[in-house]
Amino acid sequence: SGVFQLQLQEFVNERGVLASGRPCEPGCRTFFRVCLKHFQAVVSPGPCTFGSVSTPVLGTNSFAVRDDSSGGGRNPLQLPFNFTWPGTFSLIIEAWHAPGDDLRPEALPPDALISKIAIQGSLAVGQNWLLDEQTSTLTRLRYSYRVICSDNYYGDNCSRLCKKRNDHFGHYVCQPDGNLSCLPGWTGEYCQQPICLSGCHEQNGYCSKPAECLCRPGWQGRLCNECIPHNGCRHGTCSTPWQCTCDEGWGGLFCDQDLNYCTHHSPCKNGATCSNSGQRSYTCTCRPGYTGVDCELELSECDSNPCRNGGSCKDQEDGYHCLCPPGYYGLHCEHSTLSCADSPCFNGGSCRERNQGASYACECPPNFTGSNCEKKVDRCTSNPCANGGQCLNRGPSRMCRCRPGFTGTYCERHVSDCARNPCAHGGTCHDLESGLMCTCPAGFSGRRCEVRTSIDACASSPCFNRATCYTDLSTDTFVCNCPYGFVGSRCEFPVGLPPS
């Protein structure tokens, strides 16, 4: 789709006469009729297949024509067309005298014609004007012309439709050849895909607008390369999402069990030495002369029978000393070494005695590990998800989050690209390894059958007697340009032989 523009510049008719040589009274009130048609080796009358236009009276006898002249006319004259520009044309410009105000052809006498010029040739689409001057014995016409594409049409023959946009469906402007040019920050075939913040993690991050980096569940930070610990985690970190790896001094599945009670709570009194002894438990080693769990009580040597669990008390200069039986320790033999009786195994692990009860070992159920079965096994280490799927540890199982185009428990199945009916105008979709392919019906082309292509009305060779055939792209019909000696819509009749 485009416009043939004709700019009239100057008309000279010094003697003020008609084509017949008869003078105009009082002068030649001149207007123009323009006919644009398909290329003809010899320009002949007939339909103005590319369009026609008339001007109002522009002047008398000799005059210059101003741009955008007043009186309802436009200069340059516009001859719009809604087909692919063929690159060739024929142009007829007639100058007429208007005795009255009615400029319709039927209202004018045939001898009101002042002059008629006809040209033909090649003309490429472009912004540059072609200047021309046509002279007859009595008149001279100076004009220029060009063909430009209509808004949103591009290419050598104005056949490519491209409308710039900046919305959900695309972010682009149009290049002179009609190809898309993505706005900064956008990419993809239709410039719908934002370019994320530089460095944004390819799997863990995504974006909905340029220079953004949004994290998928379980990830955080500017580039989505830092994990988020488990919801219930208290004093732990992670190396993959939803983990809970305990900080120093903390234990348990959610790192909520204090293994460093001494440092955190300083429970031992009177200068006693504190020793951590498991979850939320501690041992105070009292200085001489003190006793009690927290060494809060003063002691009178062995008189108070301080040694427990069968320990024997020995008096010393600076207090006393307990000799503990096997399996016990502490200042007063008050602590037994940790054994299965202390239920040290988490998450249903079973305890086995070792060294005659002096120590133990935990046998862990599936999905748990660690010396106390306190750690959850990461089921994603075997990379079970196919086709770039993302593995997520979720509850008692693992799950695969599939990339677009894949489905199945392990993302092992390819989703048909044709499921979305991507082919326009009744095109047939074919699933291929490399993507999809559309087979287009007659009159359409392009990757998705989105481009309308003109039907070639000349394909059936409708013109006789070596006539030249042209397709009228506005109506998808043919026009026959007859050689000398033949007439008719198909040039089927010799001149002088009327149709029977």
């Epitope: 569940p217 955080q220 930070g221 988020i228 919801n231 985690c233």
Partner: antibody
Framework: EVQLVESGGGLVQPGGSLRLSCAAS????????MAWVRQAPGKGLEWVAT????????YYRDSVKGRFTISRDNAKNSLYLQMNSLRAEDTAVYYC???????????WGQGTLVTVSS | DIQMTQSPSSLSASVGDRVTITCRAS??????LAWYQQKPGKAPKLLIF???DLADGVPSRFSGSGSGTDFTLTISSLQPEDFATYYC?????????FGQGTKLEIK
């Protein structure tokens, strides 16, 4: 026990400013992303802002962008929300919560009421 | 933004009843959905995350199911302390969004 205690709420005129604080305890504050979530009187819950634990990256809902600033001080186990150019529609109970925009909000404070009115 | 629609908006039930609340997302959110319980004048409390995982200390009468766009919270046998407002929340897409809430009242 995890505890989140908000403070700093009150009555403020439209266009005014307020700074909310949240004191955290019972967990290693520096290890976890934090958020503010609000609830207008008689209405539902609405996420306001988030800050990561790793590098302090911040995110805001569109209606508060440029007016509110979320920040944290790991040494003080504290989360903050600086609210400027307050509007009547910002009136709500503001909750401090542990979580990111892409994770559940596992623990919540008791909330502090912010009333914007002339 | 993803729209989260809860139904019903309010619900009357008796102690011992089995109750189901549904939540629908305007687009696929995989299993990235949480449920919260809120009592008047109190802060919300996380009940369920990742659609079906119970948060620490939540009774087993609460359960969650679904994936994609349709999710449900079920309370198998209502207890007096369960009367409250329940909210669903998606955290699959930015920004996180909540449902409008379902108020569970005593019949």
């Amino acid at each position: 026990e995890v505890q989140l205690v908000e403070s700093g709420g009150g009555l403020v005129q439209p266009g005014g400013s307020l700074r909310l604080s949240c004191a955290a305890s019972g967990f290693t504050f520096s290890n976890f992303p934090m958020a503010w979530v609000r609830q207008a009187p008689g209405k539902g819950l609405e996420w306001v802002a988030t800050i990561s634990s790793s590098d302090g990256t911040t995110y805001y809902r569109d209606s508060v962008k440029g007016r509110f600033t979320i920040s944290r001080d790991n040494a003080k186990n504290s989360l903050y929300l600086q609210m400027n150019s307050l509007r009547a529609e910002d009136t709500a109970v503001y909750y401090c919560a542990r979580g990111y925009y892409n994770s559940p909000f596992a623990y919540w404070g008791q909330g502090t009421l912010v009333t914007v009115s002339s | 933004d993803i729209q989260m629609t809860q139904s019903p908006s309010s619900l009357s039930a008796s102690v011992g009843d089995r109750v189901t609340i549904t939540c629908r997302a305007s687009q696929d959110i995989y299993i990235n959905l949480a449920w919260y319980q809120q009592k008047p004048g109190k802060a919300p409390k996380l009940l369920i995350f990742d659609t079906s995982d119970l948060a620490d200390g939540v009774p087993s009468r609460f359960s969650g199911s679904g994936s994609g766009t349709d999710f449900t919270l079920t309370i198998s046998s209502l207890q007096p302390e369960d009367f409250a407002t329940y909210y669903c929340q998606q955290y699959d897409y930015y920004p996180p969004t909540f449902g409008q809430g379902t108020k569970l009242e005593i019949k």
